[in-house]
Interface confidence: medium
């Protein structure tokens, strides 16, 4: 498969208003998320911190791709964001809302 | 979505002389990997248990499937299994060899 | 009923430090949140941070490391804190609660940066 | 970091209608939300229009808020000016960070 196409992190900018989130979020009015993007080919690259599965699963989807799936590319590493909040109508301040950028992506 | 296509556990028996692991792998002759299989759309099930990156990815691509890829379905917890390996023409047990099984999938 | 004051000096020489205390009555701070904002004579109205009801802080970067706030919870009281005043520091300082939005303020504190 | 601009005053006259702008220098007006606040002379602020459009309870109707993404300008539009609404507004936003910007007012003059 083509570099280009392997799996990585690419941009993705979440609109709170677009997802219905505006009505409890605050602030800010959006952020950038990133999202894991491309294949999973074997053989796995190192910086996608593969499973023993995943490289298991490659393997076998390489020899037979009807008998399993690929491995597929999530994140792996995620961090938090700032948000400002509402909670039972009062703004809020969450320094670390966990979960919501990527940081790193692999192959699962 | 069809019930019956989310995302879950599915059969995936690994056969390590398919793989080419029976060069080093002794024993067993393949075990049950599992593997997971199904879609991740909105809203994610609970035990599935997805991330808040996910459940907006799988909420943005909802709304526009051009701007974001769906949430995928991966393993979450992995289990060992026992091998018995060759090191260094040494016949070698080890109890637990990480990352082998998939105990649950989830969405991320 | 909800009320907001904020007590210090009038008075502080250059390079001082300010304090002032603010004592709200009628809501909790572990509900509400707490903003300073200030305002030289005959100008706009200056951000200056923000005492959160988690007990986090947020500060206007404009004043870097001269700006200290902190409360105490259980005197309802927040405070702020401000090292190296000059001249130009002179101003009316308000502190207000923010709900949903900011619905209540002091009557504000005149201080003036004068030897 | 952008800013909030107002224009530093306007006149108008009883039983008119005014519109006061809050543009905002980059970035987009519409991306966060906008608030209004009132100020007579010498006395503590009072919220006017929060998350843009929104009323508090005790103000006005006369009182309404507004975007304009075609000059990425924030309105406060007050129908039926009244001789008690000669006072300075201030428009507030956020920054990225989630600080509070405020613009630098508008001096509103009742003839």
């Known amino acids: 498969n083509a570099k280009g196409n392997y799996c990585k992190r690419t941009p993705l900018y979440i609109d709170f208003k677009e997802i219905g989130w505006d009505s409890w979020i605050i602030a800010p009015p959006g952020y950038e998320a990133y999202e894991c993007r491309g294949v999973c080919n074997y053989p796995l690259a190192e910086h996608l911190t593969p499973t023993k599965h995943a490289i298991i699963q490659a393997l076998v989807h390489l020899k037979n791709s009807q008998k399993a799936s690929k491995a597929c590319c999530v994140p792996t590493k995620l961090e938090p964001i700032s948000i400002l909040y509402l909670d039972k109508g009062v703004v809020t301040y969450k320094f670390k809302y966990e979960g919501m950028a990527v940081s790193e992506c692999g192959c699962r | 979505n069809a019930k019956g296509n989310y995302c879950k556990r599915t059969p995936l028996y690994i056969d390590f002389k398919e793989i080419g692991w029976d060069s080093w792998i002794i024993a067993p002759p393949g075990y049950e990997a599992y593997e997971c299989r199904g879609v991740c759309n909105y809203p994610l099930a609970e035990h599935l248990t997805p991330t808040k990156h996910a459940i907006i990815q799988a909420l943005v691509h909802l709304k526009n499937s051009q701007k974001a890829s769906k949430a995928c379905c991966v393993p979450t917890k992995l289990e060992p299994i026992s091998i018995l390996y060759l090191d260094k023409g040494v016949v070698t047990y080890k109890f637990k060899y990480e990352g082998m099984a998939v105990s649950e999938c989830g969405c991320r | 009923q909800v009320q907001l004051k904020e007590t210090g000096p009038d008075l502080v020489q250059p390079t001082q430090t300010l304090d002032i205390t603010c004592t709200v009555s009628?809501?909790?701070?572990?509900?509400?949140?707490v903003h300073w904002v200030r305002q030289p004579p005959g100008k706009g109205l200056e951000w200056m941070g923000t005492?959160?009801?988690?007990?986090?802080?947020d500060y206007n970067s404009a004043f870097k490391s001269r700006l200290a706030i902190s409360r105490d919870t259980s005197k309802s009281e927040v405070f702020l804190k401000m090292d190296s005043l000059q001249t130009d520091d002179t101003a009316k300082y308000f502190c207000?609660?923010?709900?949903?939005?900011?619905?209540?303020w002091g009557q504000g504190i005149m201080v003036t940066v004068s030897s | 970091q952008f800013a909030l601009i107002q224009s530093d005053s306007m006149s108008t006259s009883a039983g008119s209608t005014v519109k006061l702008s809050c543009k905002r220098s980059?970035?987009?007006?519409?991306?966060?939300?906008v608030y209004w606040y009132q100020q007579h002379e010498g006395r503590s602020p009072t919220t006017m229009i929060y998350?843009?459009?929104?009323?508090p309870d005790g103000v006005p109707d006369r009182f309404s808020g507004s975007i304009d993404s075609s000059s990425n300008s924030a309105s406060l539009t007050i129908n039926d000016v009244q001789v008690e609404d000669e006072a300075i507004y201030f428009c507030?936003?956020?920054?990225?960070?989630?600080?509070?910007?405020f613009g630098g007012g508008t001096k509103l003059t009742v003839l």
């Open positions: 207000a609660r923010l709900g949903y939005y900011v619905d209540y």
């Open positions: 009628g809501f909790s701070l572990t509900t509400y949140n």
């Open positions: 005492m959160w009801n988690g007990g986090g802080i």
């Open positions: 980059t970035g987009n007006i519409g991306s966060s939300y």
């Open positions: 998350d843009g459009d929104k009323r």
């Open positions: 507030q936003s956020f920054s990225s960070g989630i600080k509070f910007i």
